[in-house]
């Protein structure tokens, strides 16, 4: 059988090889198509309600005047000349709809590295057969559970046209130390061949690299954090990060009521200011990052420092 | 709303004329088949006539064939059925439906407008 | 042409029976079946379009089956409302041919 692709809503004719141009004619057409069960039969005398489908020209040839998801299948004409000589003609036809250009929607702005992120979601609406999405990177395919790349599908069907609706949500894991600015876009590739992918407009989410948890530094001076009674204990959060954070400081996971500073001094240290401390940087851009809590405890003269604090009270300290 | 509304029925002589008109709303006309039936009264329903959503091809049945003539005219979302050398067995309810083809059936009708052939 | 035989041509029944109407083409005709319900004094109404396929806003007491080319109307429970005339339609081929019709009388 001749393969015939036709796009969905367009005309079609299907030549009857070996007919006489003109009536009267001996042929019949059998089709056997998503509107039939078996084969049905036309002829040019018909006319009738499959009229609206598919009928017969004045030629013999087969014209269907707007091609549907229903047509597709096996077209058959069986003609005999003047001389009684018979000729067949046989057809497969595959039906096509190229969608609308795809999109992304809910696209992200911003993603996090290290971690996974939403990119967004591709959407192609109108498509038949369903067809595919795929996701490219600067230019390049992503290859799904590569290189922490997810992709979610979904695809429905109209209950109505018949056309397919495809949607394709990507997650990645943007590495630490990557491109800030990376290129996402995603293609439509048709399901049936000999026609170009249709590609979204790119999208370029900024990447941001969260200062990691083991960069804010705390600092205790003296170290080990525990000191005579009286003595005098400095407590400094160092954050890399730029422009410099908001620090506040936390004792036994209680924040302290004081103004933010990256130095805490403890002076005259009593039984009150034994305790766990911690400080917290906070960024503008992204959440709050908490320090290495360090245990301050005070030692009676002729003790060994101790590694860990006991219960303190709720003295405050001296903010540098 | 979709509907479809006839009118143009009334008494007419054995051998005379009449033409019904089917005013089509609520839908994309042009892209239905359209299609004439008949009742007579307390009887079935009869096939009179159809057109194709062009209005290039029409279709009858015999009983009907070179007395009647259904045309549309896509512009004004109407149908129309003229009618000549009416006989008294014409008489009946006469219908506008939308389709007559394939893929449609016939799956919208109007209220109906009486014609009587009767002298 | 085309027959389409409709049985039986009138039947009573009671409220909450099941009803079934049959209509059989004279040749095949494949899907292209329609079933209407008629009123008096109103227009027919689809029910059911391509053979087995329920109409919008029908409900969903009525269902359409086909074998070969004998087609079936089922009303699993006839309510108050479904008394009237019911005919069906073969569109496969001109002449458009209905079946004689089935009236539903309350018993």
């Known amino acids: 059988a001749q393969n015939i692709t036709a796009r969905i809503g367009e005309p079609l004719v299907l030549k009857c090889k070996g007919a006489p141009k003109k009536p009267p004619q001996r042929l019949e057409w059998k089709l056997n198509t998503g509107r039939t069960e078996a084969w049905k039969v036309l002829s040019p005398q018909g006319g009738g309600p499959w009229d609206s489908v598919a009928r017969v020209l004045p030629n013999g040839s087969l014209f269907l005047p707007a091609v549907g998801i229903q047509d597709e299948g096996i077209f058959r004409c069986q003609a005999m000349n003047r001389n009684g000589k018979e000729t067949k003609s046989n057809y497969r036809v595959r039906v096509y709809q190229i969608p609308g250009k795809p999109e992304i929607v809910d696209s992200a702005s911003e993603l996090t590295a290290g971690v996974p992120n939403k990119v967004g979601t591709c959407v192609s609406e109108g498509s038949y057969p369903a067809g595919t999405l795929s996701w490219h990177l600067d230019g390049k395919p992503l290859v799904p559970n590569e290189k922490g790349v997810s992709v979610k599908e979904q695809t429905r069907r109209h209950p109505e046209t018949g056309l397919f609706t495809l949607q394709s949500e990507l997650m990645v894991t943007p590495a630490r130390g990557g491109d800030p600015r990376p290129t996402f876009s995603c293609s439509f590739s048709p399901g049936l061949p000999r026609h170009r992918a249709l590609r979204t407009a790119p999208i370029q989410p900024r990447v941001w690299e969260p200062v990691p948890l083991e960069e804010v530094q705390l600092v205790v001076e003296p170290e080990g954090g525990a000191v005579a009674p009286g003595g005098t204990v400095t407590l400094t959060c160092e954050v890399p990060a730029q422009p410099s954070p908001q620090i506040h400081w936390m004792k036994d996971g209680v924040p302290l009521p004081l103004p933010p500073s990256p130095v805490l001094i403890l002076p005259e240290i009593g039984p009150q200011d034994q305790g766990t401390y911690s400080c917290v940087a906070t960024h503008s851009s992204h959440g709050p990052q908490e320090s290495r809590a360090v245990s301050i405890s005070i030692i009676e003269p002729g003790e060994e420092g101790p590694t860990a604090g006991s219960v303190g009270g709720s003295g405050l300290g001296t903010l540098a | 709303e979709v509907q479809l509304v006839e009118s143009g029925g009334g008494l007419v002589q054995p051998g005379g004329s009449l033409r019904l008109s089917c005013a089509a709303s609520?839908?994309?006309?042009?892209?239905?088949?359209m299609t004439w039936v008949r009742q007579a009264p307390g009887k079935g329903l009869e096939w009179v006539a159809s057109?194709?959503?062009?209005?290039?091809?029409?279709y009858y049945p015999d009983s009907v064939k070179d007395r009647f003539t259904i045309s549309r005219d896509n512009a004004k979302n109407s149908l129309y059925l003229q009618m000549n050398s009416l006989r008294a067995e014409d008489t009946a309810v006469y219908y506008c439906?939308?389709?007559?083809?394939?893929?449609?059936?016939?799956?919208?009708w109007g209220q109906g407008t009486l014609v009587t052939v009767s002298s | 042409d085309i027959q389409m035989t409709q049985s039986p041509s009138s039947l009573s029944a009671s409220v909450g029976d099941r009803v079934t109407i049959t209509c059989r083409a004279s040749?095949?005709?494949?899907?292209?079946v329609n079933w209407f319900q008629q009123k008096p004094g109103k227009a027919p109404r689809r029910l059911i379009y391509r053979a087995t396929n329920l109409a919008d806003g029908v409900p969903s007491r009525f269902s359409g089956s086909r074998s070969g080319t004998d087609f079936t109307l089922t009303i699993s429970s006839l309510q108050p409302e479904d008394f009237a005339t019911y005919y069906c339609?073969?569109?496969?081929?001109?002449?458009?041919?209905f079946g004689g019709g089935t009236k539903v009388e309350i018993k």
């Open positions: 057109i194709d959503n062009s209005g290039d091809n029409t």
């Open positions: 040749q095949d005709v494949g899907i292209y």
């Open positions: 609520g839908f994309t006309f042009n892209n239905y088949w």
């Open positions: 439906a939308r389709g007559g083809d394939i893929k449609v059936g016939l799956d919208l």
């Open positions: 339609l073969e569109f496969d081929e001109h002449p458009l041919t």
